[in-house]
């Protein structure tokens, strides 16, 4: 089959890293620097991706494979093959059009990327809050009050002490 195919199409003999030159009696010419062909039988070489600016080179281009980029520190990849770099934020923040903003009360973000997400609503599962949420961390739900054995101490955090001079609501 290979022999038959090569008789039909001389280009099938050209290996990866070369192109089949239609203008030179279909001889196999090497891809020039900064270009590649990842399969045999190609009539063109692909121009290598260049990792510039906020992109940095994770893997150099070779005659048979494209370069791979990632992002410089302070940025992270987005899109297939790291097609974009997006600015990192701190935990407890999200990236907006105006830059990094703290998560609103009741939301959190435990990563340097992505958006702030609402705290888990423990009561939807019939549970109580074991550990309060913060901008950086979700709440931790504990067992429901009914699950507590008699005499067990309450898992709900104690109410904050009232400041002197403040009457109860």
């Amino acid at each position: 089959f290979e022999r038959t195919r090569s008789l039909q199409d001389p280009c099938s003999n050209c290996p990866a890293g070369t192109f089949c030159d239609n203008n030179r009696n279909q001889i196999c010419s090497p891809c020039p620097p900064n270009s590649f062909s990842s399969a045999g039988g190609q009539r063109t070489c692909d121009i290598c991706r260049q990792c510039k600016g906020v992109f940095r080179t994770r893997k150099e281009c070779s005659s048979t494979s494209n370069a791979e980029c990632d992002c410089t520190p302070g940025f992270h990849c987005l899109g297939a093959g790291c097609s974009m770099c997006e600015q990192d934020c701190k935990q407890g923040q999200e990236l907006t059009k105006k830059g990094c903003k703290d998560c609103c009360f009741g939301t959190f973000n435990d990563q340097k990327r992505g958006i702030c997400r609402p705290w888990t609503n423990c009561s939807l599962d019939g549970k109580s809050v074991l550990v309060n949420g913060t901008k950086e961390r979700d709440v931790v739900c504990g067992p429901s009050p009914a699950d507590l054995s008699p005499g067990a101490s309450s898992v709900t955090p104690p109410a904050p002490a009232r400041e002197p001079g403040h009457s109860p609501q």
Partner: nanobody
């Protein structure tokens, strides 16, 4: 938006020379192979050549008369044409692609072209 602008065309006598220029705005040539094509009245578009990374590839008609070069500082690619013949009369187009050579390729962007007329 990328714009390619060709210049340098005109009327030249047989045996004469011309240098066509292709300037890019909106993007540099850094990431692209640059090619030249030509189209004579009533004829198919014809591949002239491609330049990438110091290497040039040419169509089979030009027989060493045409040379493609590049000036990085001016973001311009040139097509030097020597010993011109009447059959070289055509509109010459500059184009860019992520493929090398561009002989069998539809370019990503192409200019409006510049007219070259070879006549005595």
């Amino acid at each position: 938006e990328v714009q390619l602008v060709e210049s340098g065309g005109g009327l030249v006598q047989p045996g004469g020379s011309l240098r066509l220029s292709c300037a890019a705005s909106g993007r540099t040539f850094d990431n692209y192979a640059v090619g030249w094509f030509r189209q004579a009245p009533g004829k198919e578009r014809e591949y002239v050549g491609t330049y990438w990374s110091g290497y040039a590839h040419y169509g089979d008609f030009e027989k060493g008369r045409f040379t493609i070069s590049r000036d990085n500082s001016k973001n311009t690619v040139y097509l030097q044409m020597n010993n011109l013949r009447p059959e070289d009369t055509a509109v010459y187009y500059c184009a860019i692609s992520l493929k090398y050579p561009m002989a069998t390729v539809t370019p990503d962007y192409q200019g409006q072209g510049t007219q070259v007329t070879v006549s005595s």
